[in-house]
């Protein structure tokens, strides 16, 4: 697991941004913009919402999501879960890496009250080449996208 | 354009801390302590609230602000916006990099209730030599400064 | 204080995770898992809740804690303080490094309301060999542990 940064290689890094297509409503992970605006990929890959590791090592992975609403949608759980999850070719289930639970709706005492909240996650995990990291938000109906600055997902090798 | 970390160079990094002079009330960005206590600059510069990049590259930039109040000030917007913005001499507008919106006042159901909240932002962006990054909070009246540990601003090259 | 990353050395990094034994109720810092699951130590050491620095340098240190409850326990302060603190052999008191204050209980308008909140801290600090960093949460009764993904503590040299 000893990881050395070779001088002729770039240090893997990425910052992916929220876009209109991020929220699929399909129960899958959030999708991200990889090339436009502030988004970039350097020494990492992307596939169907996932950052794909090309070089094994320890990575600081992070995500922020902007939450907001007017009161709370009917049927909305009082808990919002925002997490970073790992998919690996050798294991059938996603593995939780970093997770937060919040109750932002509880702030709005009236059903017509506008509220905003933000959830940030970041931490160091070991990732093997070919492993994938995705972002999930339950309930994603409360994620508020705009211009890629409020909801995002990134990583860099440490 | 490939950026490699050369082993004989220090890696640019900085951590700036909140101080009594941070809040100007002028509509400008927050100002920061760069030398005292926990604050430092290494391979980055500072000017009028801005971290100034001296070496182009990808940087993880971050900021935390401590918010608090007793109820909500009259005329206070229900949304607090905390953001990291880029300034450059050759571009007329500030560019949003990372932004959060929160409604912390909504937590206080009574007008005399004391409340606290914190907003953290962090992400990787590409910065050119000479470009500046600043922190803005709207409404800055709710930022609570103390000793440099609760509100801060930093960056390091990845 | 000039710090160079030598190419033949591993870059110090660690990620420690919350466990059933994390909350001691003794007024001491939180304790952490260092070896199981997602937890690891690489070029850093651990002792009684503290990350112990073995190589002097600038480190990005971070912690997240998951808070939650049903209403608010009697006698609970309305403010929760989550902080990263430094212990050094040459100084008798802990030094605050990065701190957040939150009022998550204020979200729950009824005493039987379930609420969740999360606090994230991260920033760059200079640490000498032998210095220790710990996490404290006041009141720790509101920290919700599960599987190491919701409350954690880590660092890496920048």
């Amino acid at each position: 697991l000893i990881q050395e940064r070779r001088s002729h290689e770039v240090n893997p890094a990425a910052h992916l941004t929220g876009a209109n297509s991020s929220l699929t409503g399909s129960g899958g992970p959030l999708l991200w913009e990889t090339q436009l605006g502030l988004a970039f990929l350097r020494g990492l890959s992307y596939h169907d919402g996932a950052l794909v590791v090309t070089k094994a090592g320890y990575y600081y992975i992070y995500s922020k999501v902007q939450l907001g609403g007017v009161g709370c949608p009917l049927g909305l759980a009082s808990t919002i879960t925002h997490g970073l999850y790992k998919r690996t070719p050798r294991y059938p289930e996603e593995l939780e890496l970093l997770v937060s639970q919040q109750s932002p709706c509880g702030r709005a005492t009236s059903s017509s009250r506008v509220w905003w909240d933000s959830s940030f996650l970041g931490g160091v995990v070991h990732l093997e080449a070919g492993e994938k990291v995705v972002v999930r938000v339950l309930d994603e109906r409360l994620v508020r996208l705009r211009d890629g600055t409020r909801s995002y997902f990134g990583a860099f090798m440490v | 354009l490939i950026q490699e970390r050369r082993s004989h160079e220090v890696n640019p990094a900085a951590h700036l801390t909140g101080a009594n002079s941070s809040l100007t009330g002028s509509g400008g960005p927050l100002l920061w302590e760069t030398q005292l206590g926990l604050a430092f600059l290494r391979g980055l510069s500072y000017h009028d609230g801005a971290l100034v990049v001296t070496k182009a590259g990808y940087y993880y930039i971050y900021s935390k602000v401590q918010l608090g109040g007793v109820g909500c000030p009259l005329g206070l917007a229900s949304t607090i916006t905390h953001g990291l913005y880029k300034r450059t001499p050759r571009y007329p507008e500030e560019l949003e990099l990372l932004v959060s919106q929160q409604s912390p006042c909504g937590r206080a159901t009574s007008s005399s209730r004391v409340w606290w909240d914190s907003s953290f932002l962090g992400g990787v962006v590409h910065l050119e030599a000479g470009e500046k990054v600043v922190v803005r909070v709207l409404d800055e009246r709710l930022v609570r400064l103390r000793d440099g540990t609760r509100s801060y601003f930093g960056a390091f090259m990845v | 204080l000039i710090q160079e990353r030598r190419s033949h050395e591993v870059n110090p990094a660690a990620h420690l995770t919350g466990a059933n034994s994390s909350l001691t109720g003794s007024g001491g810092p939180l304790l952490w898992e260092t070896q199981l699951g997602l937890a690891f130590l690489r070029g850093l050491s651990y002792h009684d809740g503290a990350l112990v620095v073995t190589k002097a340098g600038y480190y990005y240190i971070y912690s997240k804690v998951q808070l939650g409850g049903v209403g608010c326990p009697l006698g609970l302060a309305s403010t929760i303080t989550h902080g990263l603190y430094k212990r050094t052999p040459r100084y008798p008191e802990e030094l605050e490094l990065l701190v957040s204050q939150q009022s998550p209980c204020g979200r729950a308008t009824s005493s039987s309301r379930v609420w969740w909140d999360s606090s994230f801290l991260g920033g760059v600090v200079h640490l000498e060999a032998g210095e220790k960093v710990v996490v404290r949460v006041l009141d720790e009764r509101l920290v919700r542990l599960r599987d190491g993904t919701r409350s954690y503590f880590g660092a890496f040299m920048v």
Epitope: L41, Y46 | I2 | -
Partner: antibody, heavy 118, light 107 residues
Framework: QVQLVQSGAEVKKPGASVKVSCKAS????????IYWVRQAPGQGLEWIGY????????KYNQKFKDRVTMTRDTSISTAYMELSRLRSDDTAVYYC???????????WGQGTLVTVSS | EIVLTQSPDFQSVTPKEKVTITCRAS??????LHWYQQKPDQSPKLLIK???QSISGVPSRFSGSGSGTDFTLTINSLEAEDAATYYC?????????FGQGTKVEIK
């Protein structure tokens, strides 16, 4: 230094297919996307699509999506762009270009002239 | 799609003169605008990225400015080797698009 070397000129008949190659050197091939851009004689530049060399993921301009296929062979650090059902207005110089992470292009191949003529 | 319209289409300029080429976007593209130079029978060459950012190895006489929908490439003191066609490109929305080009000729 980064180099992108493309295959030689091709002459094709309408309805045929052409496959242009782009061999990369001077960097780790899987680290950056490869884009394809074309330029008809005396005309401007037109984006065709890109490929992620690591996993073969692609994004195509809607205008070409029914006719273009981008592939790669990581063992020889080479990307390919195949255009099928060629028409005379596909006559152009086809360029591969490499990003530095986002959608702008500091590195370009020398271009491959594809002539479609009956 | 975002349409980029350059003006003028053609410019004949004497050496040492200042050259200004504009690029107008059909909708706001923030600062996500890049400039390329292409000489006859050569590949395009990146001159400026993100509206104003200079590129290593590109002479300092080339500069960029603008924001939102209106952008400018300036060549401060034209040299004979600058005879070429110049293109703008946006990276704000898919599909990526280029301007139609501005040909600069030396008088």
């Amino acid at each position: 230094q980064v180099q992108l070397v493309q295959s030689g000129a091709e002459v094709k008949k309408p309805g045929a297919s052409v496959k242009v190659s782009c061999k990369a050197s001077g960097y780790t091939f899987t680290d950056y996307y490869i884009y394809w851009v074309r330029q008809a004689p005396g005309q401007g530049l037109e984006w065709i699509g890109y490929i992620d060399p690591y996993n073969g993921g692609t994004k195509y301009n809607q205008k070409f999506k029914d006719r273009v296929t981008m592939t790669r062979d990581t063992s020889i650090s080479t990307a390919y762009m195949e255009l099928s059902r060629l028409r005379s207005d596909d006559t152009a110089v086809y360029y591969c270009a490499r990003t530095s992470g986002s959608s702008w292009f500091p590195y370009w191949g020398q271009g491959t002239l594809v002539t479609v003529s009956s | 799609e975002i349409v980029l319209t350059q003006s003028p289409d053609f410019q004949s300029v004497t050496p040492k003169e200042k050259v200004t080429i504009t690029c107008r976007a059909s909708q706001s593209i923030s600062n996500n605008l890049h400039w390329y130079q292409q000489k006859p029978d050569q590949s395009p060459k990146l001159l400026i990225k993100y509206t104003y950012q200079s590129i290593s190895g590109v002479p300092s006489r080339f500069s960029g400015s603008g924001s939102g929908t209106d952008f400018t490439l300036t060549i401060n003191s034209l040299e004979a080797e600058d005879a070429a066609t110049y293109y703008c490109q946006q990276s704000n929305r898919w599909p990526l698009t280029f301007g139609q080009g501005t040909k600069v000729e030396i008088k």
